[in-house]
Interface confidence: low
């Protein structure tokens, strides 16, 4: 391509006329601001092609780039084009106008950019300033392009003096965009609501500044659109939030709510979904089984736990024998109900160092304005057995009796055993169990009493021994669910009667 005049920079006078010629071995064309101005194209007898661009009545607005390029680039190097820059110094034109999008310069990384403020006269001195500052910034200026450098997120203006007047350019805004892979989170104020209550969902994107939110939800499918609200969380940089608010929910609003977020710079997208349940009214539901009979061991601590689901949050009360329980100042009873998830609760009654008096009928009641549930159980205090008395007597009948008395809860079992060889018993020889009906030499009589006040059983057992001919170790063992206790007595034979 051959351009005349060759440039690459021309300074032309205002109101003048100027002719640009471009020729080449294939059809050629002049371009100005991505368009083809009116021009004369011709083909010479030697086969060369030319295009003549006539610029008439020049003004400052004709300042800029002119390109000559092949009209049809098939089979040709696409990069073959000639650039010419023309200045038309014009005191009536300050800075050349910019398209609106040139005033906003977006960056996704730290890189050199150009603030494209250009003048019509290459002799003018142009300076760059922050919009609210007078100090000229030390940034190199190219009359054909503007100021190039690395800029912070600020507003900038260019200044020049034409004759005796100072001229300011439009403001240029530099934005460094935060762009990263999209990470969306969706949450709801409540995932369970009653009809008539509000559904409020929030979709939050972190690490991006320019994103588009799109919600899908049950109402949308029936053509009833809800306008979301988007805001920036000012206290958290690069957190953008879209809020979907549905007032006065209906049963049909139950379902999946999806937030889809797209980021246009790198064309990333992500979506998250959440399920919302609209119920006609609140509910309280017990989860799991709690037996109607519960046990606690005397002087030990015991926690009774009830798990339930509820919405809205319920009031929880505990009762013992129809009297309301509260945390005791002495620390003997502790009540707690904790929210383990949005609608799941665990209520605990802790009895510290359990006393006999704490046995009884317990009820937990959970309720709110829509529903209630109650759960009752009997608490039995288990008391380890203890042998209170083991005594031997010689009634006139000639037989010998051993009496064993003990207490415990639940009812203790009694086991009698005896050992005849005192030296070897019980380490080497196992004791013999007594009281079986097949044994004629011993008889057993056992009585059981329940003491209401102490809430425990008393067992009294009498062992009758028919023939004791040598010392005998007799052992009474009481056993129940929470322990056992043993006592031992040596029974000696009756001495022979004294004869005169």
């Amino acid at each position: 391509l051959v351009v005349t005049p060759p440039g690459p920079e021309l300074v032309l006078n205002v109101s003048s006329t100027f002719v640009l010629t471009c020729s080449g071995s294939a059809p050629v064309v002049w371009e100005r601001m991505s368009q083809e101005p009116p021009q004369e194209m011709a083909k010479a007898q030697d086969g060369t092609f030319s295009s003549v661009l006539t610029l008439t009545n020049l003004t400052g607005l004709d300042t800029g780039e002119y390109f000559c390029t092949h009209n049809d680039s098939r089979g040709l190097e696409t990069d073959e084009r000639k650039r010419l820059y023309i200045f038309v110094p014009d005191p009536t034109v300050g800075f050349l106008p910019n398209d609106a999008e040139e005033l906003f310069i977006f960056l996704t990384e730290i890189t050199e950019i150009t603030i494209p403020c250009r003048v019509t006269d290459p002799q003018l001195v142009v300076t760059l300033h922050e919009k609210k500052g007078d100090v000229a910034l030390p940034v190199p200026y190219d009359h054909q392009r503007g100021f190039s450098g690395i800029f912070e997120d600020r507003s900038y203006i260019c200044k020049t003096t034409i004759g005796d007047r100072e001229v300011d350019s439009d403001a240029y805004y530099v934005y460094r965009l935060q762009v990263s892979s999209i990470n969306v989170s969706v949450n709801a104020v409540q995932t369970v609501v009653r009809q008539g209550e509000n559904i409020t969902l929030m979709c939050i994107v972190i690490g991006n500044e320019v994103v588009n939110f799109e919600w899908t939800y049950p109402r949308k499918e029936s053509g009833r659109l809800v306008e979301p609200v988007t805001d920036f969380l000012l206290d958290m940089p690069y957190h953008i939030r879209s809020i979907l608010h549905i007032p006065s929910a209906e049963l049909e609003d139950s379902g999946t709510y999806t937030c889809n977020v797209t980021e246009s710079v790198n064309d990333h997208q992500d979506e998250k979904a959440i399920n919302i349940t609209v119920v006609e009214s609140g509910y309280v539901r017990l989860l799991g089984e709690v037996g109607t009979l519960q046990f606690a061991e005397l002087h030990r601590s015991r926690t009774l736990q009830v798990v339930f689901e509820a919405y809205p949050p319920p009031t929880v009360l505990w009762f013992k024998d129809n009297r309301t329980l509260g945390d005791s100042s002495a620390g003997e009873i502790a009540l707690s109900t904790r929210n383990v998830s949005e609608t799941r609760y665990v209520s605990e009654l802790t009895l510290v160092r359990v006393k006999v008096a704490e046995a009884g009928h317990y009820t937990m009641r959970a309720f709110h304005e829509d529903a209630e549930v109650q759960l009752s159980f009997q608490l039995q205090i288990n008391v380890p057995v203890r042998v209170l008395e083991l005594s031997e007597s010689h009634p006139d009948s000639g037989e010998q009796t051993v009496r064993c008395r003990g207490r415990g809860m639940p009812q203790p079992n009694i086991i009698w055993s005896a050992c005849r060889d005192l030296k070897r018993c019980p380490r080497e020889l196992p004791p013999t169990l007594l009281g079986n009906s097949s044994e004629e030499e011993s008889q057993l009589e056992t009585n059981v009493t329940y003491w209401e006040e102490e809430q425990e059983f008393e067992v009294v057992s009498t062992l009758r021994l028919q023939h004791v001919d040598r010392p005998l170790s007799v052992r009474c063992t009481l056993r129940n669910a929470v322990g056992q206790d043993t006592q031992e007595v040596i029974v000696v034979p009756h001495s022979l009667p004294f004869k005169v």
């Epitope: 009653r194 049963l251 006609e280 009214s281 609140g282 509910y283 304005e369 829509d370 529903a371 209630e372």
Partner: nanobody
């Protein structure tokens, strides 16, 4: 003024069935909860079953589950309690109740309006 009138009570053998009716009048009952309660001699009034007027959601006491069925006929403004496999312990005065807050259908007391009751006696 809301009025509730119960009927259908009577004497029945154990194992038998009865159908109680509650005629409601005085207003439209959309948004209401309707319920049946019962009171045996010398005992407190106990919840039996409930239903929401608009949507027909139901709720039963443990003692009624599987044997009793609550229903409503909006056109006739009537609530029913179908009672099968009756036992002597079902003997009581049965009351119809209504509350303007439908969401109360799972609550076991505190209904705003009550009927006069109908006697059910189950003999062994």
């Amino acid at each position: 003024e809301v009025q509730l009138v119960e009927s259908g009570g009577g004497l029945v053998q154990a194992g038998g069935s009865l159908r109680l009716s509650c005629a409601a009048s005085g207003r439209t009952f959309n948004g209401y909860a309707m319920a049946w309660f019962r009171q045996a001699p010398g005992k407190e009034r106990d919840f039996v079953a409930s239903i929401t007027w608009s949507y027909g959601y139901t709720y039963y006491a443990d003692s009624a589950q599987g044997r009793f069925t609550i229903s409503r006929d909006s056109a006739k403004n009537t609530v029913y309690l179908e009672m099968n496999s009756l036992k002597p312990e079902d003997t009581a005065v049965y009351y119809c109740a209504a509350d303007p807050k439908a969401s109360r259908f799972r609550i076991l007391r505190q209904y705003a309006h009550w009927g006069q009751g109908t006697q059910v006696t189950v003999s062994s």
